[in-house]
Interface confidence: medium
């Protein structure tokens, strides 16, 4: 079976002039997933991102996250890239506080 992830992109204040953007994927199966941040369509270097482990979410599916710190005002240049079971999608940083997108393939 394959269950596509729900992708949730959030932002939070980090320090003056910077924000932390977090991309969470949840409810997916199997556990193999690629989640990373891209700037202008190019993957950020590994050292500038932080990842959570892939963990069971209690419903027979899995969850994980990736975060990075960016300059406030440049949000539109960043997208979260997700690949799962041969399908992929990109998710923008919300202009408000929270944006929830269900992947549809």
């Amino acid at each position: 079976r394959t269950v596509p992830p729900m992708v949730n992109v959030t932002r939070s204040e980090a320090s003056e002039g910077n924000i932390t953007v977090t991309c969470r994927a949840s409810g997916f199966y199997p556990w193999n997933i690629t989640l990373s941040w891209r700037q202008d369509g190019v993957s950020l270097s590994h050292d500038t991102q932080q990842w959570g482990d892939v963990l069971p979410d209690g419903n027979g599916t899995y969850q994980t996250w990736v975060a990075t710190r960016i300059c406030q005002g440049e949000e539109q240049r960043f997208t979260c890239y997700m690949e799962h079971s041969g399908n992929h999608s990109t998710h923008p940083v919300p202009s408000g506080k929270v944006l929830v997108l269900q992947s549809h393939w």
């Epitope: 193999n32 690629t34 990842w51 482990d53 963990l55």
Partner: antibody, heavy 119, light 108 residues
Framework: QVQLQESGPGLVKPSETLSLTCTVS????????VHWIRQPPGKGLEWIGM???????DYNAAFISRVTISVDTSKNQFSLKLSSVTAADTAVYYC?????????????WGQGTLVTVSS | EIVLTQSPGTLSLSPGERATLSCTAS???????LHWYQQKPGQAPRLLIY???NLASGIPDRFSGSGSGTDFTLTISRLEPEDFAVYYC?????????FGQGTKLEIK
Amino acid sequence: QVQLQESGPGLVKPSETLSLTCTVSGFSLTTYGVHWIRQPPGKGLEWIGMIWTDATTDYNAAFISRVTISVDTSKNQFSLKLSSVTAADTAVYYCARKGHGYYYAMDYWGQGTLVTVSS
Amino acid sequence: EIVLTQSPGTLSLSPGERATLSCTASSSVSSSYLHWYQQKPGQAPRLLIYSTSNLASGIPDRFSGSGSGTDFTLTISRLEPEDFAVYYCHQYHRSPFTFGQGTKLEIK
């Protein structure tokens, strides 16, 4: 800095249980999983199994009937137990950290410990 | 299980030359889960390239990786003396996670 160190008996008798520990530092056992891999003398690498951060395990089917991987967070240690060993289990045994953003690649390895199975 | 076949088994080249190492999978592997390791005698393997084409931390840019599906390649543009070692490809696409048998890169 991140370090992993395997330890255990260098000699195990046939039919007995091989027991190794992997002591780690520089990262949290509740944040990273660990793999066990072995390498027979002069040969290639073979994946034995791994433990996730929630202590669930995933084993190579070739070992599943006789392998146990566990974690003791209070000691910063992972352990490997392989029962009913034979001479074919003689190998260098490695523990390696499961990287996050490296898409499950093994980003840090211990130096390995040689285990010889012989009577 | 997914079998990874590396070729050639041994590659004899001189410093300064270009090395091309191949890894062929018995079934398709997501490019995200195909990695390369370098192992020198008496040492543990070291992560070289992750997700087909991304350099691991501290790896010089003379190393590069490419490929998709079942065919993957590791290239060293200009060999340095310290590059002579055994190279393994590794798939984390499907359990059991497997390694190729290795390519030994030796000095000619």
